[in-house]
Interface confidence: medium
C-alpha cells in the first residue's frame, strides 16, 4: 500500500510506545557510542515530528522515507566525527547509500564497558523513581551492545524485564526473586542476539536465496502438515521481516512481523496444530511463542521421496522449468520427514541433489546418472551423527568446564592467530552444546547441536571479520554457510604457526581473582590455558592438564592465605617456573 507519509503510517500501526522504543533501538544500534541522553533527545524529536505527520500527512517533510528522516536526524549529532571517525563520512552520501554506509559501520564488538549489575535496592529505587527512563535505558544498553538484535523481540525482552521489576521490587526477598529472572533474561538475550546475527549474516553475506533455503527447511520441520504453497508463503513473508530488521528498517520489520503472526494465527488450521496456545497470547508473546513453537507431528503415510525425485521420468523437466521451486519442494519434502536432522544437514543434502541434477540432466542418460543420488546422502548424514556421539560421550565424561577446556585447546591449535578473548568466548559457547543438547534423545540431538554450533561459529566469523588474522578462519567462514562446521571440524593443528614469545606477565595473577564469581574465575583460567597453547602448540593433553591442575591449586591456596597478594607474587613465580619446565618453554 502506498502511504502519503510512511512515518505517520508506522506511528499509527505501531502506537506511540512501540514507535519510540523501536526508534531508540534503531538509533542505538547505529550510533553505539552516543550517550543515552542524546539518543532520548533524538527519539523525542522524531516522535514529535511523527505526530505532526499523523495530524497532517501533507505537512512539510512528512513524505520523506524513514531512512531519509532517521539518517538526517543521526547526522545532526555534533560529535559524530570525534566519536565515530570515518562513519561521519556516511553523512555526505545520499540515500540509499547513506544507510548502507551506516550498516557497514555497525560494530559487533564495540569498545563499551561491561554492564555491571547494581545492588537490587538501587535498581528497584531507580525503577520506581522513573520507570520509563529505566526501561528505555535497558533497550539502549542492549541495542548498542548487540547492533543486530531482533528489534521486535527486544520489545518482548523489555516487557519481561519490566514484569520482573514490577513483581520483585514488592517481594519480601527482592534479590531472591529478581536475580534469577535477570540471569535468565541475560542468557536468553545473548542466545537470541547470536541467533539473529546468523540470520543477518546469512542474508548479507550469502544472499536472500540462502536465507530462504534455511527458512524452507526449518519451517517444513516445524509445520510438516502444511502444504508447500503455505510454507512458501510463510518463507517469503519471514524473509521480508528479517531483511528489514537486518537492514535497520525496524519499524517496517516490527509491523510486518505482527502481520505475519496475525496471518499464521488466522490460518493455523492449515499450518500447525501446535499454535493454539501461542495464538491466544498478546502480540509480543504471540510472536515469540510462534518463533519457538515445537514441531507438529508428521502426517501419517507420507509417500516415498524417490517417486518424485529419483524414479520419475520428469525429474529433469521439473528441474529445468523451475529450478528453485523444484529444489524448494525437495527441501520441503525432505525436511518435513526429518525433524531429526539439523537444518544445515538438510541444506547440504539439497545442495548435493542440486549438484547431481546439474551434472546428470546434461548427461546422455539422465535417469541412469541420478538413480543413486540418495546413496550419496549416507556419509553426509553419518558425519554429524558420529561427531555428536563422540562429543557427547566426551562431555558426559568431563563435565562442562573441562569439556570447554578440551575445545579451547582444540580450537587454539586449529586457529592460534585468533585473539585470546575471542577463542575463550567462542570455545566456552561451543562447550555449552553439551549441557544444551546431549541430554536430548537421539532424535533431537542433531538439530539441537549442529544448528547451535552454526550460531556459535557465526560469532567467530563476525568477530574475525572485524580484524582478520587467519586465512583458515576466513576460508571456513566465507566458502559455504552450511559447511562452516564441517570445515572447522576438519582443520588440523596449524603447522605454519610460529609460537608466541613467552611473557611472564600473562601468567601473573593477583588477589582480585579471589573475589570473582565462579564464571569469571573460569574465564581467567581458560584465558591462561589459551595463552599456554599459543606458547606451546605442541604440548600434549597430559602436559596441559598438569599445568592447569597446578594453576587451580595455586589459586585455591593463595585465596585461603592471610596475605593473599604476597602469596600470589611468590607462589606465582614458582608456578611460572614449574610450568615452563613442564612444557619445555
Amino acid at each position: 500500500d502506498a502511504h502519503k507519509s510512511e512515518v505517520a503510517h508506522r506511528f499509527k500501526d505501531l502506537g506511540e510506545e512501540n514507535f519510540k522504543a523501536l526508534v531508540l533501538i534503531a538509533f542505538a544500534q547505529y550510533l553505539q557510542q552516543c550517550p543515552f541522553e542524546d539518543h532520548v533527545k533524538l527519539v523525542n524529536e522524531v516522535t514529535e515530528f511523527a505526530k505532526t505527520c499523523v495530524a497532517d500527512e501533507s505537512a512539510e517533510n512528512c513524505d520523506k522515507s524513514l531512512h531519509t528522516l532517521f539518517g538526517d536526524k543521526l547526522c545532526t549529532v555534533a560529535t559524530l566525527r570525534e566519536t565515530y571517525g570515518e562513519m561521519a563520512d556516511c553523512c555526505a552520501k545520499q540515500e540509499p547509500e547513506r544507510n548502507e554506509c551506516f550498516l557497514q559501520h555497525k560494530d559487533d564488538n564495540p569498545n563499551l564497558p561491561r554492564l555491571v549489575r547494581p545492588e537490587v535496592d538501587v535498581m528497584c529505587t531507580a525503577f520506581h523513581d522513573n520507570e520509563e527512563t529505566f526501561l528505555k535505558k535497558y533497550l539502549y544498553e542492549i541495542a548498542r551492545r548487540h547492533p543486530y538484535f531482533y528489534a521486535p523481540e527486544l520489545l518482548f525482552f523489555a516487557k519481561r524485564y519490566k514484569a520482573a521489576f514490577t513483581e520483585c521490587c514488592q517481594a519480601a526477598d527482592k534479590a531472591a526473586c529478581l536475580l534469577p529472572k535477570l540471569d535468565e533474561l541475560r542468557d536468553e538475550g545473548k542466545a537470541s542476539s547470536a541467533k539473529q546475527r546468523l540470520k543477518c549474516a546469512s542474508l548479507q553475506k550469502f544472499g536472500e536465496r540462502a536465507f530462504k533455503a534455511w527458512a524452507v527447511a526449518r519451517l517444513s520441520q516445524r509445520f510438516p502438515k502444511a502444504e508447500f504453497a503455505e510454507v512458501s508463503k510463510l518463507v517469503t513473508d519471514l524473509t521480508k521481516v528479517h531483511t528489514e530488521c537486518c537492514h535497520g528498517d525496524l519499524l517496517e520489520c516490527a509491523d510486518d512481523r505482527a502481520d505475519l503472526a496475525k496471518y499464521i494465527c488466522e490460518n493455523q488450521d492449515s499450518i500447525s496444530s501446535k499454535l493454539k496456545e501461542c495464538c491466544e497470547k498478546p502480540l509480543l508473546e504471540k510472536s515469540h511463542c510462534i518463533a519457538e513453537v515445537e514441531n507438529d507431528e508428521m502426517p501419517a503415510d507420507l509417500p516415498s521421496l524417490a517417486a518424485d525425485f529419483v524414479e520419475s521420468k520428469d525429474v529433469c523437466k521439473n528441474y529445468a522449468e523451475a529450478k528453485d521451486v523444484f529444489l524448494g519442494m525437495f527441501l520441503y519434502e525432505y525436511a518435513r520427514r526429518h525433524p531429526d536432522y539439523s537444518v544445515v544437514l538438510l541444506l547440504r543434502l539439497a545442495k548435493t541433489y542440486e549438484t547431481t541434477l546439474e551434472k546428470c540432466c546434461a548427461a546422455a542418460d539422465p535417469h541412469e546418472c541420478y538413480a543413486k543420488v540418495f546413496d550419496e546422502f549416507k556419509p553426509l548424514v553419518e558425519e554429524p551423527q558420529n561427531l555428536i556421539k563422540q562429543n557427547c560421550e566426551l562431555f558426559e565424561q568431563l563435565g562442562e568446564y573441562k569439556f570447554q577446556n578440551a575445545l579451547l585447546v582444540r580450537y587454539t591449535k586449529k586457529v592460534p592467530q585468533v585473539s585470546t578473548p575471542t577463542l575463550v568466548e567462542v570455545s566456552r559457547n561451543l562447550g555449552k552444546v553439551g549441557s544444551k543438547c546431549c541430554k536430548h534423545p537421539e532424535a533431537k540431538r542433531m538439530p539441537c547441536a549442529e544448528d547451535y554450533l552454526s550460531v556459535v561459529l557465526n560469532q567467530l566469523c563476525v568477530l574475525h571479520e572485524k580484524t582478520p588474522v587467519s586465512d583458515r578462519v576466513t576460508k571456513c567462514c566465507t566458502e559455504s554457510l552450511v559447511n562452516r562446521r564441517p570445515c572447522f571440524s576438519a582443520l588440523e593443528v596449524d603447522e605454519t604457526y610460529v609460537p608466541k614469545e613467552f611473557n611472564a606477565e600473562t601468567f601473573t595473577f593477583h588477589a582480585d581473582i579471589c573475589t570473582l564469581s565462579e564464571k569469571e574465575r573460569q574465564i581467567k583460567k581458560q584465558t591462561a590455558l589459551v595463552e599456554l597453547v599459543k606458547h606451546k602448540p605442541k604440548a600434549t593433553k597430559e602436559q596441559l592438564k598438569a599445568v592447569m591442575d597446578d594453576f587451580a591449586a595455586f589459586v585455591e591456596k593463595c585465596c585461603k592465605a592471610d596475605d593473599k597478594e604476597t602469596c600470589f607474587a611468590e607462589e606465582g613465580k614458582k608456578l611460572v617456573a614449574a610450568s615452563q619446565a613442564a612444557l619445555g618453554l
Epitope: A229, D308, N318, V325, M329
Partner: nanobody, 126 residues
Framework: EVQLLESGGGLVQPGGSLRLSCAAS????????VAWFRQAPGKGREFVAG????????YYADSVKGRFTISRDNSKNTLYLQMNSLRPEDTAVYYC???????????????????WGQGTLVTVSS
Amino acid sequence: EVQLLESGGGLVQPGGSLRLSCAASGRYIDETAVAWFRQAPGKGREFVAGIGGGVDITYYADSVKGRFTISRDNSKNTLYLQMNSLRPEDTAVYYCAARPGRPLITSQVADLYPYWGQGTLVTVSS
C-alpha cells in the same frame, strides 16, 4: 478437501474431438498439481496428461502427445482436456485427479493423487 467433478464425455467418431472439463471446489486449482487419468475396460488407470500448479508445466503420456492439450482457467477453477484426432483406443473412463501441496510436480503415479472425480465416459467408435 478438494471436490472434483468431470463433464464433457460422450460418443464420438474416430478423428473427432471432445473437450472434457473438471470443476474443482474447496481449493484453488492453480495451487494444485492436477492430472487426467483414464481407465479402459479391464485395465488399470493410465496417466494421460498433467499440469503443475504455480508454474504451468505440462506433461503428456507418449500415446496422446500432439493430440491432447491440458489447460486450466484459474478464474473458473476448472481444468480442461482438449482431445483431438481421437482413436478407438482412447475409449475409457476419464478421471480428473488433484495433488495439493505439490504445486510443481505432476506425478504419473495414480497412487500419489489423494483426490479423484467420479469420471466421465469417452467412447470413440464409428
